[in-house]
Amino acid sequence: AGVFELQIHSFGPGPGPGAPRSPCSARLPCRLFFRVCLKPGLSEEAAESPCALGAALSARGPVYTEQPGAPAPDLPLPDGLLQVPFRDAWPGTFSFIIETWREELGDQIGGPAWSLLARVAGRRRLAAGGPWARDIQRAGAWELRFSYRARCEPPAVGTACTRLCRPRSAPSRCGPGLRPCAPLEDECEAPLVCRAGCSPEHGFCEQPGECRCLEGWTGPLCTVPVSTSSCLSPRGPSSATTGCLVPGPGPCDGNPCANGGSCSETPRSFECTCPRGFYGLRCEVSGVTCADGPCFNGGLCVGGADPDSAYICHCPPGFQGSNCEKRVDRCSLQPCRNGGLCLDLGHALRCRCRAGFAGPRCEHDLDDCAGRACANGGTCVEGGGAHRCSCALGFGGRDCRERADPCAARPCAHGGRCYAHFSGLVCACAPGYMGARCEFPVHPDGASALPAAPPGLRPGDPQRYL
């Protein structure tokens, strides 16, 4: 268990031209508040999908009235942190949506009116217990600066808040098999042991020895799937053996959803399905219209002319999400060649090429032979982004610049002696052998296996190999 904490530092016009109009005026003073929605993992879920990790609403900020003629400054913010408690392990990777809402305080009939000013979304990795992480996000012409962290609630510790710490029983050391709890060195790690046999998939515990069931499972070890067919009432009798849900107050009892929203239970809480024109954890906010500019990235807003009708964002190619806030994964078409890594930077696709390849799509096999000759008559051979020189006889090395010892490989057969020569090598053959490499035996009758020795050379003479 633990708490995700969000600190809003500023909300105001972003850099660059086209400063936004102040959201408040002398005729219509207003104040801001923020909503944060957290989801586990790096999911690219729609903005309206459940905030499975939790959500929080800030207090209202100070009332602000625009000074006539003045540009929109950073707007006054609510005091304090937005805190989203989480009951289970911190997932380490999460998605967030932070919405900036405006509450107009004019003398409207029926109380204040709310409208969405900006929505930013992102995906992050974060270890619990770490320092505050700072972030800047832009939504249209607005800029939001904020910090966030996840911290564990005692006795939980660790990057996922899954380890428990207990005060030491002895002042000097922890019990057998238990480590000191960093950073609380005066405490000891205590493994959280649920009741023996408690289902790891369908049960959990907040205190050692207990076994609490997720929705849809029952029994002392949460191994019995709920079957409502034999139940006497919608919540069923309190018998674990029948596999019926245990009676008791449910999170939807009393319907926490405002403005005609319908409530459905989730494994850990409840979820409101709001009617058109209403929004928020409990359908408590309303009034998002196309006039509020809810569509990002050039999306076209249709409908939503008044707070009671829903708006729809028609996204330009390459964008999606209910507010066109998400980019389509263009890398799934695998445009990079030769094993390059695809990166979708938003404004462009980039390929990170493997060694030996280059070009916007890694399409060029680096031609190391271009512009570099192999010395001493060697020829360049390409392959796999590297090059090598096939050297002429008598030369070696990467560029054929080194004079090779032609006799190093002992090329003369049958005991012939090798002599280096400016044009190669010469073999002086042992008696009874002849040929450029002394490879041919001379027949006993004086004839050789070769047709005839070249003029001027008798069998047994040194033969020069050209």
Epitope: L333, Q334, P335, C336, L349, P360
Partner: nanobody
């Protein structure tokens, strides 16, 4: 400027077939990668089938064995033959292409989409 023009969408019964076409035109030096994405109502846009930069064919797991992608290089056109269609294949199908322009730059383009509806 590059245009991708899709055609071939329509309404079909479950188990039926459709063939989508996408023709690329404009200041194209070469087509690096080209394929099809789809977006069902309320869902994310997903890659369905394509020719990668390496020239390999790739398919989403959900369409393997039912959809076949092919191309006509001379016409800068790709085709998606869809067979054994199911209700869950209902979506707007978008053509996508990673193109090398005459300027030698690469750009990624989308078509406007063609609607495929599978219903009894």
């Amino acid at each position: 400027e590059v245009q991708l023009v899709e055609s071939g969408g329509g309404e079909v019964q479950p188990g039926g077939s459709l063939r989508l076409s996408c023709a690329a035109s404009g200041s194209i030096l070469s087509i690096n990668a080209m394929g099809w994405y789809r977006q069902a109502p309320g869902k994310q846009r997903e890659m369905v089938a394509g020719f990668t930069g390496e020239g390999n064919t790739i398919y989403a797991e959900s369409v393997k064995g039912r959809f076949t992608i092919s191309r006509d290089n001379a016409k800068n056109t790709v085709y998606l033959q869809m067979s054994s269609l199911r209700a869950e294949d209902t979506a707007v199908y978008y053509c996508a292409a990673d193109v090398q322009l005459f300027s030698r730059d690469y750009e990624f383009y989308w078509g406007q989409g063609t609607l495929v509806t599978v219903k009894p």
